[in-house]
């Protein structure tokens, strides 16, 4: 609701932004605080225990001063006033400094990502043109699930160099479509690392790996754990031989028994010869019986 325009009482005109203002009524704040003074001393507002109603008045004053959107010097110091902003307000802003982004994320720390924060991040990333490493570092520190909240299209703007900022927990909620986009970037980012170091870094991204990369890994004694194996793409696992899976998992191969009813293990078992499965000595059942001919129907379709 618009605050009525009333003259400032004699002697009450604010000469600076300080604690005395907490005793001002809403209409007095409106009448006695100059918006330009407020803007130049925004960094003081957060230290003053204004009520939410008083903050509404201060926001209204800034809106009048900056109808096209606030400048960054003001945005960076909004503090709790940021919680009063609507996504529509934030869409008018041009936020370019990582310090500004951090300052506003700090205000919302510990809460779910609000529509305001989502809009702020969107404005910031679009302004930068890509999701660089420093930005990704900052965003995942505040919101570990941030990366997985992006669409595959948005993820395509992540440069391979930014992948170094990604921690395994940042990928926990990513689906296969997202990992399909991230995996090639990770492969590129970590390509100069040696075998064991490379595997440690690439492991969280393997849900986007194709069959040929899994075959290559099986030759490197990586000892993939079952949790990682269970996140692999089913279509990438199916063509692997029993020998390749055994090499890929190393001592963890015994865990297949506990997962034999779950994908991708279940589907992979159905594609293997029972004889080959028996060589593992795990009692895995459901493979192709001896003497049966395996027809690769996908090959047949390709030929017709």
């Amino acid at each position: 609701r618009e605050v009525e325009k009333t003259a400032c009482p004699s002697g009450k005109k604010a000469r600076e932004i300080d604690e005395s203002l907490i005793f001002y009524k809403k209409w007095e704040l409106e009448a006695c605080v100059d918006a330009a003074l407020l803007a130049t001393q925004m960094d003081r507002v957060n230290a003053i225990p204004f009520t939410y109603e008083q903050l509404d008045v201060l926001k209204h004053k800034l809106d009048e001063l900056y109808p096209q959107g606030y400048p960054e010097s003001v945005i960076q110091h909004l503090g709790y006033l940021f919680l009063k902003m609507s996504p529509e307000d934030i869409r008018k802003w041009n936020v370019t400094s990582l310090e500004t982004l951090k300052a506003l994320l700090e205000v919302n720390k510990g809460h779910e990502m609000s529509p305001q924060v989502a809009t702020l991040i969107d404005r910031f990333v679009k302004g930068r043109g890509q999701l660089d490493k420093d930005t990704l570092d900052t965003l995942t520190a505040f919101y570990p699930g941030y990366l997985c909240s992006l669409s595959p299209e948005e993820l395509s703007s992540v440069p391979p160099s930014s992948i170094w900022a990604v921690r395994p927990q940042d990928l926990d909620t990513c689906d296969p479509r997202q990992l399909d986009v991230l995996y090639p970037k990770a492969r590129l980012a970590f390509q100069n690392m040696n075998g064991s170091e490379y595997f440690v870094k690439i492991q969280s991204f393997l849900g986007g790996a194709p069959t040929e990369d899994l075959k290559a890994l099986s030759q490197q004694n990586v000892s993939m754990d079952l949790a990682t194996f269970m996140k692999l793409r089913t279509d990438a696992v199916l063509p692997l031989t029993v020998a390749e899976v055994q090499k890929l998992l190393g001592p963890h191969v015994e865990g297949l028994k506990a997962e034999e009813r779950h994908r991708p293990v279940r589907d992979w078992i159905l594609r293997q010869r029972q004889d080959d499965l028996d060589t593992l000595g795990l009692g895995l059942q459901g493979g192709i019986p001896n003497g049966y001919l395996v027809l690769d129907l996908s090959m047949q379709e390709a030929l017709s």
Partner: nanobody, 114 residues
Framework: QVKLEESGGGLVQPGGSLRLSCTAS????????LTWYRQRPGNERELVAS??????????ADSVKGRFTISISRDNGKMITYLQMNSLKPEDTAVYLC?????WGQGTQVTVSS
Amino acid sequence: QVKLEESGGGLVQPGGSLRLSCTASGSIWSASGLTWYRQRPGNERELVASITTGGETTWYADSVKGRFTISISRDNGKMITYLQMNSLKPEDTAVYLCNSRSYWGQGTQVTVSS
């Protein structure tokens, strides 16, 4: 940490002009604006003019409106705020101090006298 250093004060005749400078260094990004205060002997410190760090917005006390102009520039990671004081009056005599958040400069003396 922010370091503020004022310069440009001096003795000037009524109606004359002076230009004060305040050089701010350190983590100055943490301030929303820079402010000039003045302290007259036996008087309260008075806010004279302030400006946002981006230079978009300025504010002046009624007593200096139309006579003083505040501006800002950046140079090698430092921020310099200028206070151009025209049509000076004897009542403008004071120590002028630069302020940013809780940081203060040492002040520079301005004396307006014939």
